[in-house]
């Protein structure tokens, strides 16, 4: 807390300007009017205040707005935003995308801080859903943002927002998140033609069920191996050798190099060896010719 002291004669600040950098902390507290500060917040960023001085300015704003800052002030906080705690931010009501962008710009190049996470949470909750423009903005600043959301939070993403998602935005998503996003992507891109559809849906396929993979295998898509290996193991296992061959096209040749990794390894174990031989890759580990394959899961369901 800065002690309350009277402002020395002639030091009352008529405006926020560079002369204030020479003020001691107590002088800033005594001589800068909080209402003036609030209306001239945009000037603060241009002035090289020390961290201690910024603490005083924050204190003045906190006193003026104990229930939380208005958006007109928030939008111009600039580097003062870095002084805010998540508790401060929870009092705000940020509705403008421009305000969000301005504050994200301050934290640009850094990991997502608790302050930023709280700000985004407040903003998205205020909007009710993660719309396309918001998602566009958030993924531009934080490519991993989408994958930081829980499946429950992702369920509020409308299919129309999926158009804003870039492949790199999904790099760190786990299968549970892709399970939520894939149906939305399928809906969003449903009116596209075959090859264009595949380009768009490709990065979401980690959430695709077997029947959709089978359908894709009929469309000459030539899925690359990296995409194939991100597919759900339970979705890949029922695919036949012919279907995998059609799905991967020329990239099927790479299965040999990845035969020890999932889902390739598990899939090989499920195939008949003579079917694997048709791939021309020397893959081993399939079911020997003449063996009977029992689907135990089907048997359990019947009993």
């Amino acid at each position: 807390e800065v002690e309350k002291t009277a402002c020395p004669s002639g030091k009352k600040a008529p405006e926020i300007d560079e002369s204030l950098i020479f003020y001691k902390k107590w002088e800033l507290e005594a001589c800068v009017d909080a209402a003036l500060l609030a209306t001239q917040m945009d000037r603060v960023n241009a002035i090289p205040f020390t961290y201690e001085q910024l603490d005083v300015l924050k204190h003045k704003l906190d006193e003026l707005y104990p229930q939380g800052y208005p958006e007109s002030v928030i939008q111009h906080l600039g580097y003062l935003f870095l002084k805010m705690s998540p508790e401060d931010i929870r009092k705000w009501n940020v509705t403008s995308l421009e305000t969000l962008k301005a504050l994200l710009e301050v934290n640009k190049g850094h990991e997502m801080s608790p302050q930023v996470a709280t700000l985004i949470d407040r903003f998205v909750k205020g909007r009710g859903q993660l719309d396309k423009d918001t998602l566009d903005t958030l993924t531009a600043f934080y490519p991993g943002y989408l994958c930081s959301l829980s499946p429950e939070e992702l369920s509020s993403v409308p299919p129309s927002s999926i158009w804003a998602v870039r492949p790199q935005d999904l790099d760190t998503c786990d299968p549970r998140q892709l399970d939520v996003l894939y149906p939305k992507a399928r809906l969003a891109f449903q009116n596209m033609n075959g090859s264009e559809y595949f380009v768009k849906i490709q990065s979401f396929l980690g959430g695709a069920p077997t029947e959709d993979l089978k359908a894709l295998s009929q469309q000459n898509v030539s899925m690359d191996l990296a995409t194939f290996m991100k597919l759900r193991t339970d979705a890949v296992l029922p695919l036949t050798v012919a279907e995998v061959q059609k799905l991967l096209g020329p990239h099927v040749e790479g299965l040999k190099a990845e035969e020890r990794h999932r889902p390739v390894r598990d899939w090989i174990l499920r195939q008949r060896q003579d079917d694997l031989d048709t791939l021309g890759l020397g893959l081993q580990g399939g079911i020997p010719n003449g063996y009977l394959v029992l689907d135990l899961s089907m048997q359990e369901a019947l009993s």
Epitope: L225, A226, H251, K256, A257, H261, L279, G280, L281, G282
Partner: antibody, heavy 115, light 113 residues
Framework: QVQLQQPGTELVTPGASVKLSCKAS????????MHWVKQRPGQGLEWIGN????????FYNEKFKNKATLTVDKSSSTAYMQLSSLTSEDSAVYYC????????WGQGTTLTVSS | DIVMTQSPSSLAVSVGQKVTMSCKSS????????????LAWYQQKPGQSPKLLVY???TKDSGVPDRFIGSGSGTDFTLTINSVQAEDLADYFC?????????FGGGTKLEIK
């Protein structure tokens, strides 16, 4: 040891076709796909396409789709590439190479298209 | 198509020197599931066919001398030759096998002073 044998040279006239061969030995022919690569003098390498010797499936670089046709003869462990409607642009060294990693290469066939 | 860019296009070094050449791809070649980069390096000596040196960006093919070292991940790759020998005079090509059409870099010509 693994060997991919290719004829050294082929001389053909413009407009004609030519069938280049690549005889494999020293490994199981149907356990590795065969790739074909083009190299023009002083220039880089271009992937033409590949073939699965086990079932004859072929895949082509779009650029060579109407130029090259890949086939195999399993009985003689030989891969073939037919090039059609030849022009001077097709004059180059053509290599066959084994598998996804291209771990073994033939010595290359120098194709000269000239009248 | 993935564009592969090699630099420098040529360089001349003395026997025993260390040499480094670069290969950049226009998109990532990393399969994050297996942590393999689908990039290979080939050596082509004058009048000969290319020979595989390194695959998966850093795995040496059998019989390749220890002085050849491949490194890098994603889009930036390097081939280093520690203590260059006279027999290393050759063109060096990188190639991606992440997606078709498989593409090669323009090559780096290594000359011995």
């Amino acid at each position: 040891q693994v060997q991919l044998q290719q004829p050294g040279t082929e001389l053909v006239t413009p407009g004609a076709s030519v069938k280049l061969s690549c005889k494999a030995s020293g490994y199981s022919f149907t356990s590795y796909w065969m790739h074909w690569v083009k190299q023009r003098p002083g220039q880089g390498l271009e992937w033409i396409g590949n073939i699965n010797p086990s079932n004859g499936d072929t895949f082509y670089n779009e650029k060579f789709k109407n130029k090259a046709t890949l086939t195999v003869d399993k009985s003689s462990s030989t891969a073939y590439m037919q090039l059609s409607s030849l022009t001077s642009e097709d004059s180059a060294v053509y290599y066959c190479a084994r598998g996804w990693l291209r771990d073994y290469w033939g010595q290359g066939t120098t194709l000269t298209v000239s009248s | 198509d993935i564009v592969m860019t090699q630099s420098p296009s040529s360089l001349a070094v003395s026997v025993g020197q260390k040499v480094t050449m670069s290969c950049k791809s226009s998109q990532s070649l990393l399969n994050s599931s297996s942590q393999k980069n689908y990039l290979a390096w080939y050596q082509q000596k004058p009048g000969q066919s290319p020979k595989l040196l390194v695959y998966f960006a850093s795995t040496k093919d059998s019989g390749v001398p220890d002085r050849f070292i491949g490194s890098g991940s994603g889009t930036d790759f390097t081939l280093t030759i520690n203590s260059v020998q006279a027999e290393d005079l050759a063109d060096y090509f990188c190639q991606q096998h992440y997606t078709t059409p498989y593409t090669f870099g323009g090559g780096t010509k290594l000359e011995i002073k």
